[in-house]
């Protein structure tokens, strides 16, 4: 990778081990936990990142800082099974043979069952709503400036094309970023909205996944945009299948 011709590191994923053992002595990086080769010009899949996070030695792991506002997927962190492309396998099981089905962002979408549970396909999360509340500012941000800045951020930092940022809504102090992406809309090289949302979530929490890059410094016309809470909602192409018991 150019990634770091000189010191051989992965700019888009610090949870990697890199060495100049690629073709022609080029830098090649592998994700911790899975050992899978990653492309350091783009985001690493959320599945491989979760796997790396779970495999990191306890004392080196950067745990999520507990916060009453932080919404983790209700089941919290787990060590996922990833397919050869780094995507979540449709069925996930823990060490005690409890299994469940997940969507493309790794969030549970069925009740938990046993090893007989079948998950026929990986259901795509095609709509992600990122709900942010920003800290008080002197005045409200200009909506169009905010929209432009967030689109620029998602393109430059997360490599997500603006076509997938469906809308930016703003009613001070709440900002909502809508990401939409059907399977058929993704062209070669397009970043997955689930991966972009995960990198953004980690950036907002001050747990950047980028190597040696400063933390997220969001500014709208020079005014700092500081987020005090984040909620992320995932909508799947096929609605989830939970029993009525859970819904009550």
């Amino acid at each position: 990778h150019t990634a770091a011709q000189d010191n051989c590191t992965c700019p888009t994923n610090k949870m990697t081990v890199c060495s100049p053992d690629g073709p022609g002595g080029r830098c090649q990086c592998r994700a911790l936990g899975s050992g899978m080769a990653v492309d350091c010009s783009t985001l690493t899949s959320k599945c491989l990142l979760l796997k790396a996070r779970m495999s990191a030695p306890k004392n080196a792991r950067t745990l999520v800082r507990p916060s009453e506002h932080a919404l983790v997927d209700n089941d919290g962190l787990y060590d996922p099974d990833c397919d050869p492309e780094g995507r979540f396998k449709a069925r996930q099981c823990n060490q005690t043979s409890v299994c469940w089905c997940v969507n493309s962002v790794g969030v549970r979408r069925t009740d938990k069952g046993d090893l007989s549970l079948r998950c026929d396909e990986l259901v795509r999360t095609h709509h992600i709503l990122i709900d942010l509340r920003h800290r008080p500012t002197a005045g409200a941000f200009n909506h169009s400036d905010l929209d432009a800045e967030l689109r620029r951020l998602f393109r430059e930092r997360y490599r997500l094309h603006p076509k997938f940022v469906a809308a930016v809504h703003y009613e001070q102090p709440t900002i909502q970023i809508e990401l939409r992406q059907n399977t058929s809309q993704k062209a070669a090289g397009d970043v997955d909205i689930g991966d972009a949302a995960y990198y953004f979530e980690r950036d907002i929490k001050g747990e950047s996944l980028f190597q040696g890059r400063g933390g997220l410094d969001l500014r709208v016309r020079g005014e700092p945009l500081q987020v005090e809470r984040t909620l992320i909602y995932y909508l799947d192409e096929i609605p989830p299948k939970f029993s009525m018991k859970r819904l009550t």
């Epitope: 150019t2 393109r155 430059e156 603006p162 058929s184 993704k186 062209a187 070669a188 090289g189 397009d190």
Partner: antibody, heavy 119, light 108 residues
């Protein structure tokens, strides 16, 4: 192998419109971005706009202020670029080029279509 | 828009020479820099993408380096077929994607 074949040269009068076609083969048309780039005689390259053939999403270089329209026909794996209100400065070779979503590199190009605008 | 500036705008060299062309971006573009070769009357051809990755079929005498705002295309040993015009292009930010003005490489 990947091929992009463009329509032939055109001569147009100022104020008219031109529509250039680009037929793709050798790959799945809907799986790659398609871009249009032009080059005036003896000049550099200028990006005009892009389309995702799968859903028809487009974005354009604001320089062209609504004069450019990019469309596609997935049944024939063909992309089109229409430029309206032509002026003499639009005389150029127009290229279609297949693009990558992350690098935004143009890995395969059409042979080019010369559009001459002259009264 | 991000401006891309190439230097030199033209240069003369001989077969076997080592040649370097530089490209400077008006702001940080990380590594999202691509290089193209164009011969008279022909369409451009992609040589290098993402600063240093060789496009398929491109000879290994071509190499690229750089990061941020300053980038370099190097031809280690010029061959007769390398005399052409070279363009850099950034794919970092929101459209429009921009090209350098070109560097014409001529036979000395």
């Amino acid at each position: 192998q990947v091929q992009l074949v463009q329509s032939g040269a055109e001569v147009k009068k100022p104020g008219a419109s031109v529509k250039v076609s680009c037929k793709a083969s050798g790959y799945t048309f809907t799986s790659y971005w398609m871009h249009w780039v032009r080059q005036a005689p003896g000049q550099g390259l200028e990006w005009m706009g892009e389309i995702t053939p799968s859903d028809g999403y487009t974005s354009y270089n604001q320089k062209f202020k609504g004069r450019v329209t990019i469309t596609r026909d997935t049944s024939t794996s063909t992309a089109y670029m229409e430029l309206s209100s032509l002026r003499s400065e639009d005389t150029a070779v127009y290229y279609c080029a297949r693009g990558h979503g992350n690098y935004v590199s143009f890995d395969y190009w059409g042979q080019g279509t010369l559009v001459t605008v002259s009264s | 828009d991000i401006q891309m500036t190439q230097s030199p705008s033209s240069l003369s060299a001989s077969v076997g020479d080592r040649v370097t062309i530089t490209c400077r971006a008006s702001q940080d573009i990380s590594n999202y820099l691509n290089w193209y070769q164009q011969k008279p009357g022909k369409a451009p051809k992609l040589l290098i993408y993402y600063t240093s990755r060789l496009h398929s079929g491109v000879p290994s005498r071509f190499s690229g380096s750089g990061s941020g705002t300053d980038f370099t295309l190097t031809i280690s040993s010029l061959q007769p077929e390398d005399f052409a015009t070279y363009f850099c292009q950034q794919g970092y930010t929101l459209p429009p994607y921009t090209f350098g003005q070109g560097t014409k490489l001529e036979i000395k």
